[in-house]
């Protein structure tokens, strides 16, 4: 007759004794603690050792779990050789926002006070400080008698009066090949009209470089046009005491933020900028603090997330909130600020945000970031030996060359990039490995051992519940339905325990002949 092995069949079967379970358990030491001999010192010592090991295991596992939930990270630094590198975007701005020759009477009428060229009564404020030639031109432009003001737009003013790359760029070479003003894309920043080389945004592919060193980068010679600098008779956010250009080397994936992140380059010098690409990989919470960037950047005005984009986005929102307008360099569709709004609201509001408000524009680090490490060095230009030649070449005076010409060399130092990567110090696999190792070391257990314990506990609990009569009907029904031919009494009549005690291996039957029978099929397992 076939014996059925499904668990549901015999609800009231008595579970194996603890001794029988212990002797077959894969949990080390259990067989010695629950052996058949009566209580002895040996059993007590085994029990003590087992409990001690269990206590140490719990302590060690608790510490490991706590360590895991601290979410520590480590930083891995690596240098990776590359056969080619994408050359960064290079943004440059003249520190003078508007060319003196391009400021019209209408411009002066509307923006004269903003530029500190006029006072609030449309007068030239302090004629003692003025250059005679400039003063003459300005006095003519500032004569507003019978002048009919025309509409004025700050964006158009910045665009028209800002320095033109075609006038500033005296020479340009990239990887030894000639480049031109056409390779520079106009971009507006807080410095006004600026230019980006290799922006990757004008339909052209991003330029690559195959070697390190000065000959494989960008070399430009610029005329900063100090003759065009506006006279400074007062201080506003639009006036500058400096001469030169501001430069930012950045990834094509982020907009320039040159007023905050740029470095200055002075006329009269050739400045060498040796770069190294750094790819930074940060971890999101809880291991780190970076912002995992989704396809949607979460920014109002930019498609891809970067700290720069976030800050510009935030500054734009702040200005629209405070002044109901935006600066010329800001994205969006709010109206451009008028000169009055610049002076009375936009400039002071943005200054306050940048300098004072510690909370409004806190931008999270993206999880992937490319930045460029820079080393700057400079030499004097022109030399005494070359001053005359350059003056003749560019049809300028030697003094003009010394005060206005600069050379900028930007190149990769070596053709490799640095990866700075945050890595999880302790992952779930490490935690499981540690716990598994400690379980093996201290109590000789595995996951399956734990399942064994649960299985036995389940049998005991089920039996206790069945004894109260909850399973009787089920058991009878099972017997009737399934035709189980072997009752508990039949098994007990065999009384195999005595004969088995001296037999370490027990008697083996085919597995699954009887209910709740382990795969080894030792009779002792379920009868004793």
């Amino acid at each position: 007759m076939e014996l059925k092995a499904e668990e549901e069949e015999v609800g009231g079967v008595q579970p194996v004794s603890i001794q029988a379970f212990a002797s077959s358990s894969t949990l080390h030491g259990l067989a010695h603690i629950f052996s058949y001999e009566r209580l002895s010192l040996k059993r007590a010592l085994w029990a003590l050792c087992f409990l001690g090991s269990l206590a140490v295991l719990l302590c060690v596992c608790t510490e490991r779990v706590q360590y895991y939930f601290h979410y520590h990270h480590v930083t891995k630094l690596d240098e990776v050789a590359a056969s080619q590198l994408t050359f960064p975007a290079v943004t440059l701005c003249n520190l003078n926002e508007f060319r003196f020759s391009q400021v019209s009477k209408n411009d002066l009428y509307h923006a004269g006070e903003l530029l500190a060229l006029l006072n609030n009564r449309y007068e030239i404020p302090d004629t003692q400080m003025a250059d005679e030639k400039q003063l003459e031109i300005l006095q003519d432009k500032a004569n507003f008698r019978s002048f009919k003001p025309k509409p004025f737009n700050m964006r158009e003013f910045y665009d028209r009066a800002g320095h033109d790359i075609r006038d500033m760029l005296l020479s340009c070479h990239f990887r030894g090949e000639v480049c031109s003003a056409e390779d520079f894309k106009v971009v507006f920043t807080r410095y006004g009209k600026c230019y980006t080389f290799n922006s990757g945004r004008d339909g052209r592919p991003r330029l690559k470089t195959m070697k390190g060193g000065t000959g494989n980068g960008l070399e430009i010679m610029l005329d900063i046009q100090q003759d065009e600098y506006l006279p400074v008779w007062g201080e506003t956010d639009e006036t500058s005491f400096e001469a030169g250009i501001k430069v930012q080397i950045h990834s094509q994936d982020e907009p320039p933020f040159i007023d905050q992140l740029g470095f200055g380059v002075a006329p009269g010098f050739q400045t060498f900028v040796a770069c190294q690409e750094q790819r930074l990989i940060y971890l999101p919470p809880p291991w780190g603090t970076c912002k995992a960037v989704t396809m949607d950047s979460d920014l109002d005005f930019f498609d891809s997330y970067s700290i720069t984009a976030c800050r510009i986005d935030c500054e734009t929102r702040y200005l629209v909130e405070n002044c109901n307008c935006r600066m010329v360099h800001m994205p969006g569709d709010a109206p451009y600020c008028t000169p009055e709004q610049y002076k009375e609201c936009a400039d002071p509001a943005l200054d306050f945000l940048v300098e004072k408000d510690q909370e409004y524009c806190v931008c999270e680090m993206p999880c992937n970031l490319t930045r460029y490490g820079k080393e700057l060095s400079m030499v004097k230009i022109p030399s005494k030996a070359s001053a005359k030649y350059l003056a003749k070449k560019f049809n300028k005076s030697e003094q003009y060359i010394g005060e206005n010409i600069l050379v900028l060399d930007i190149f990769f130092e070596v053709l490799n990039y640095e990866t700075i990567e945050q890595k999880k110090a302790y992952e779930i696999a490490g935690l499981l490995g540690d716990i598994g190792g400690q379980m093996g070391l201290f109590i000789g257990a595995s996951i399956l051992t734990v399942l064994e314990l649960f299985d036995y506990a389940y049998e005991v609990i089920k039996h206790k519940l069945c004894r109260r009569g909850k399973c009787q009907k089920e058991a009878k029904r099972s017997s009737a339905d399934k035709g189980v031919a072997l009752s508990l009494d039949d098994v007990k009549r065999h009384n195999p325990c005595e004969s088995l005690r001296g037999h370490p291996a027990g008697m083996t039957y085919a597995a699954n002949i009887l209910p709740h029978h382990p795969a080894r099929g030792t009779f002792e397992d379920f009868t004793c």
Epitope: Y318, E321, N322, C345, P348, A349, D351, F352, L353, E355, K356, D357, Q358, E359, Y360
Partner: antibody, heavy 116, light 107 residues
Framework: EVQLLASGGGLVQPGGSLRLSCAAS????????MSWVRQAPGKGLEWVSG????????YYADSVKGRFTISRDNSKNTLYLQMNSLRAEDTAAYYC?????????WGQGIRVTVSS | DIQMTQSPSTLSASVGDRVTITCRAS??????LAWYQQKPGKAPKLLIY???NLESGVPSRFSGSGSGTEFTLTISSLQPDDFATYYC?????????FGQGTKLEIK
């Protein structure tokens, strides 16, 4: 129109408590830090306390530290000043103000009198 | 804390006069200084912010200048409505502080 409306003043005994409120309208309240300023009768202006836009950071003048608590409820566009252990020298007109590149506007001022 | 010292404490002047009030900070506050006018029983009225910016609606006879630690408020031609108490305030860093005030009275 940007407006601040203060309320909650009155007469209180020394050692007593009072809670001032300042309801804001016409601007994104949570974007701006706010402050309380007071002026004792016949005296000058004295800054009392400030709070950041999120309410995370709070600041106090030495004269009120430990006794006054500034807070805000951005969902209700309201600024609060909880004043405990009041003293006679806390008698003043209290103004709330919006902090930014310029402190504008100010609330109308509410009178707090501490007297037995 | 940054101390703000205003001078003079009291100033007597006549209509049409040019008047200058000075405010000195105990340490640099960049340009984060405001000037207020206050009349009895009224809330302070903002005149100048960020040292030199004239608040809209304020007559152009009021002007502010200075940066760092030295600041001045100038009224180019006093009008009858200008007789009041004037306060400077630094808002460069907490604790924000006010000057002790300058009472401008009719001579």
């Amino acid at each position: 129109e940007v407006q601040l409306l203060a309320s909650g003043g009155g007469l209180v005994q020394p050692g007593g408590s009072l809670r001032l409120s300042c309801a804001a309208s016409g601007f994104t309240f949570s974007s701006f830090a706010m402050s309380w300023v007071r002026q004792a009768p016949g005296k000058g202006l004295e800054w009392v306390s400030g709070i950041s836009g999120s309410g995370v950071s709070t600041y106090y003048a030495d004269s009120v530290k430990g006794r006054f608590t500034i807070s805000r409820d951005n969902s209700k566009n309201t600024l609060y000043l909880q004043m405990n252990s009041l003293r006679a020298e806390d008698t003043a007109a209290y103004y709330c103000a919006k902090e930014a590149y310029k402190w504008q506007p100010w609330g109308q001022g509410i009178r707090v009198t501490v007297s037995s | 804390d940054i101390q703000m010292t205003q001078s003079p404490s009291t100033l007597s002047a006549s209509v049409g006069d040019r008047v200058t009030i000075t405010c000195r900070a105990s340490q640099s506050i960049s340009s984060w200084l405001a000037w207020y006018q206050q009349k009895p029983g009224k809330a302070p009225k903002l005149l100048i912010y960020k040292a030199s910016n004239l608040e809209s609606g304020v007559p152009s006879r009021f002007s502010g200048s200075g940066s760092g630690t030295e600041f001045t408020l100038t009224i180019s031609s006093l009008q009858p409505d200008d007789f009041a108490t004037y306060y400077c305030q630094q808002y460069n860093s907490y604790s924000y502080t006010f000057g002790q005030g300058t009472k401008l009275e009719i001579k």
